[in-house]
Interface confidence: medium
């Protein structure tokens, strides 16, 4: 999960750019991402008790179907086949009223924040936070970006406590600590 | 059990090379970026390099740049510090860092004496 | 660059007693768009290597006992030690990682135990 060059002092960051329809901007990496994707458990630190919860889904594991699934019966396959399209469909089209309705809410609100320290126009966002922004909408300023941190599939080695994270339904597991992505 | 453990050090002449290392291991290595920290005898702490996880980042401070290398074998969960024409001023302690969010973890140090 | 000041360079305090180390940055840390401070606090005892001991200026590390306290915002900051123990014997140093490269720290203050 790779995202562009960006100067590394943080500064002239472009503003988020839009995202495709299966993927949701998230303030926290800055970055698009698969609406479903989760980050990695944090190792525990020495002396730490029972390793961090996991969720159902990690990021190096296959999202489509598994070995057990591959040999579905030809009425599975013509049946199933359309289902998922039509899913997919639906969730693009929700995904599309998402991403609209937000826009109209920030230009409601007249999003943009004007202060600015020594920074990028990227900001990290609190660790709840993995939203869906329109594109063109920038922070005036921020820390360096990324805050310090690693790959969005990654929290850092200790304690991992998952919460919903997402205002599309999937859960990520987070930390206390996380402050966000890789520098890039 | 998070670890970091650094060797290397030792004593080299000025202008000498030295490669130090920190092998990883309790912790995804290959998820995560590094920074190796120095200790000059009776001084403070001095951030010396950067390497993001997958090495496509790197940087240096402006006292070693040109001279230190930072690099990783992520398969290998090893961290290196390639130091070439040491300086006295490079004599220190070097520290290698789990990079999250600040230095999370640090490990127990080499020890490099640059002198003739 | 940032450049990160701590005062006093060393102090000396009896077991039991309240101590309070300042550190304070070249511009600020403080980040409006998510009100956190970008300062680390770290403390490193002698012949050992650095320990993190808050984060986000005031959140303590698992593990760090409740003596410790961060707080400040913006450019001043300040380490509070409730109530010394001998094994608080140490140096400690802060750090900011508001823009970077270079993670800078402080110079760091002693704490002596009388």
């Known amino acids: 999960m790779r995202r562009g060059p960006r100067s590394l002092r943080g500064r002239d960051a472009p503003a988020p750019t839009p995202c495709v329809p299966a993927e949701c901007f998230d303030l926290l990496v800055r970055h698009c991402v698969a609406c479903g994707l989760l980050r990695t458990p944090r190792p525990k630190p020495a002396g730490a008790s029972s390793p961090a919860p996991r969720t159902a889904l990690q990021p190096q594991e296959s999202v489509g179907a598994g070995a057990g699934e591959a040999a579905l019966p030809l009425p599975g396959l013509l049946f199933g086949a359309p289902a998922l399209l039509g899913l997919a469909l639906v969730l693009a089209l929700v995904l599309v009223g998402l991403v609209s309705w937000r826009r109209r809410q920030r230009r409601l609100r007249g999003a943009s924040s004007a202060e600015a320290p020594d920074g990028d126009k990227d900001a990290p966002e609190p660790l709840d936070k993995v939203i869906i922004l329109s594109p063109g909408i920038s922070d005036a300023t921020a820390p360096a970006w990324p805050p310090p941190g690693e790959d969005p599939g990654t929290t850092p080695p200790g304690h991992s406590v998952p919460v919903p994270a997402t205002e599309l339904g999937s859960t990520e597991l987070v930390t206390t600590k996380t402050a966000g992505p890789e520098q890039q | 059990d998070v670890q970091l453990v650094e060797s290397g050090g030792g004593l080299v002449q000025p202008g000498g090379s030295r490669k130090l290392s920190c092998a990883a291991s309790g912790f995804t290595f290959s998820s995560f970026g590094m920074h190796w920290v120095r200790q000059a005898p009776e001084k403070g702490l001095e951030w010396v390099a950067y390497i993001n996880s997958g090495s496509s980042t790197i940087n240096y401070a402006d006292t070693v740049k040109g001279r230190f290398t930072i690099s990783r074998d992520n398969p290998k969960n090893t961290l290196f510090l390639q130091m070439t024409s040491l300086r006295s001023e490079d004599t220190a302690m070097y520290y290698c860092t789990i990079y999250y969010y600040a230095m999370d973890y640090w490990g127990q140090g080499t020890s490099v004496t640059v002198s003739s | 660059d940032i450049v990160m000041s701590q005062s006093p360079s060393s102090l000396t305090v009896s077991v039991g007693e309240k101590v309070s180390m300042s550190c304070k940055s070249s511009?600020?840390?403080?980040?409006?768009?998510?009100?956190?401070?970008?300062l680390a606090w770290y403390q490193q005892k002698p012949g050992q290597s650095p320990k993190l001991l808050i984060y986000w200026a005031s959140t303590r590390e698992s593990g760090v006992p409740d003596r410790f306290a961060g707080s400040g915002s913006g450019t001043d900051f300040t380490l509070t030690i409730s109530s010394v123990k001998a094994e608080d014997l140490a140096v400690y140093y802060c750090?900011?990682?508001?823009?970077?490269?270079?993670?800078?720290f402080g110079g760091g203050t002693k704490l002596e135990i009388k």
């Open positions: 511009q600020t840390l403080l980040y409006s768009g998510n009100q956190k401070n970008y």
């Open positions: 750090q900011q990682y508001y823009i970077y490269p270079p993670w800078t």
